[in-house]
Interface confidence: medium
């Protein structure tokens, strides 16, 4: 992946920078929990999970069992927000690359194990057709190691 | 990867003072910058923003329509421009660099030494 | 609202620092330490992704309005002031900070 700067559309990385992309975030990490859960299993052990709640017993967090709330109303809402802020990328199948890769980059410090990242990186792709926009043709996803802060 | 803040010096209530934050080590365009303020003896208050091309400006409610931030990405330099300056804007200012593009989502990971700012008659 | 506004601690201590909001800003929420005379630095942000560098006995944990930053054995280099960061939403407000002051 080239960096921002050799790639000449300044236009696109400024429509970027006004794009909120937090809920497509929000509403991917909420459907690869939910996706984790109905296969009967903890992806983590607490001591891995960087969206546990408080370890401490006596503090429980009022957003368990999971801090994205895993009941539908909040992911449909993320995932409307989402929707709206992609469908400004829908003219600019390039720019929608370079969304889908910064949303990647993001979270990418955030995903635990291959496995996990790699249904991120699905669901991800698959982000664009969900909303009923068309995806890019070719995008690449993978993100070097040192994430954000390779640059 | 560094920044450095320049410009911090006696300013006049009411009057205008211009701070600079040269930045190396990184590609500039990649990031926003952030300045950050701290009055004597108290905590930080988050001033204003930019984003990487600087397409995007936010600021606190505080220096809204007194201050302005600017950047030159040829140069690797934002600038914070302090007009009708007040008793209150005292403080050491921070120039701090953002993990994105987009402002502040994810934390400041490299801050300047600070500039100093004294309004007084 | 960040609490305490300081605290007294020894070497070796379990230290807690809370960060309380009016309102939900989901995991956009970072931790700085501030020694005196210097710049702050960025400890964990999202909430709960410590920052390359940091040691590990520091944590933070929480969601939505209530956040946590632990440091699970305080060393003699952590005495300074701590600040959350909301990251929610413009302004980007700082806690008032918490100061940890050797007993």
């Known amino acids: 992946r080239q960096q921002w700067e050799l790639q000449g559309d300044r236009r696109c990385q400024s429509q970027l920078e006004r794009a909120n992309l937090r809920p497509c975030e929000q509403h991917l990490m909420q459907k690869i929990q939910r996706d984790e859960d109905s296969y009967g299993r903890d992806p983590y052990s607490p001591s891995q999970d960087p969206y546990s709640p408080s370890q401490d017993p006596d503090r429980r967090d009022p957003y368990s069992p999971s801090p994205y709330d895993r009941r539908g109303a909040g992911s449909s809402q993320h995932q409307e927000r989402c929707c709206n802020e992609l469908n400004e990328f829908e003219n600019n199948q390039r720019c929608m690359c370079e969304a889908l890769q910064q949303i990647m980059e993001n979270q990418s410090d955030r995903l635990q194990g291959r496995q996990q990242e790699q249904q991120f990186k699905r669901e991800l792709r698959n982000l664009p057709q969900q909303c009923g926009l068309r995806a890019p043709q070719r995008c690449d996803l993978e993100v070097e190691s040192g994430g954000r802060d390779r640059y | 990867v560094q920044l450095v803040e320049s410009g911090g010096t006696l300013g006049q209530p009411g009057g205008s003072l211009r701070l600079s934050c040269t930045a190396s080590?990184?590609?500039?365009?990649?990031?926003?910058i952030n300045w950050v303020r701290q009055a004597p003896g108290k905590g930080l208050e988050w001033v204003a923003a930019?984003?990487?091309?600087?397409?995007?400006?936010y600021y606190a409610d505080s220096v809204e329509g007194r201050f302005s931030i600017s950047r030159e990405n040829s140069n690797n330099t934002v600038f914070l421009e302090m007009n009708n300056l007040r008793g209150e804007d005292t403080a050491v200012y921070f120039c701090?660099?953002?993990?994105?593009?987009?402002?502040?989502?994810?934390?400041?990971?490299?801050w300047g030494q600070g500039t100093t700012v004294t309004v007084s008659s | 609202t960040q609490s305490p506004s300081s605290l007294s601690a020894s070497v070796g201590d379990r230290v807690i620092i809370t960060c309380r909001g009016s309102?939900?800003?989901?995991?956009?929420l970072n931790w700085y330490q501030q020694k005196p005379g210097k710049a702050p630095r960025l400890l964990i942000s999202?909430?709960?992704s410590l920052q390359g560098g940091v040691p590990s006995r520091f944590s933070g944990s929480g969601y939505g309005t209530d956040f946590t930053l632990t440091i699970s054995s305080l060393q003699p280099e952590d005495f300074a002031t701590y600040y959350c960061?909301?990251?929610?939403?413009?302004?980007?407000?700082f806690g008032q900070g918490t100061k940890v002051e050797i007993k």
């Open positions: 701090a660099k953002d993990r994105t593009p987009v402002t502040n989502y994810y934390g400041m990971d490299v």
């Open positions: 080590g990184f590609t500039f365009n990649r990031f926003a």
């Open positions: 930019i984003s990487g091309t600087g397409a995007v400006t």
């Open positions: 309102q939900t800003i989901d995991n956009y």
């Open positions: 999202a909430a709960s």
């Open positions: 960061q909301q990251t929610s939403s413009t302004p980007y407000t």
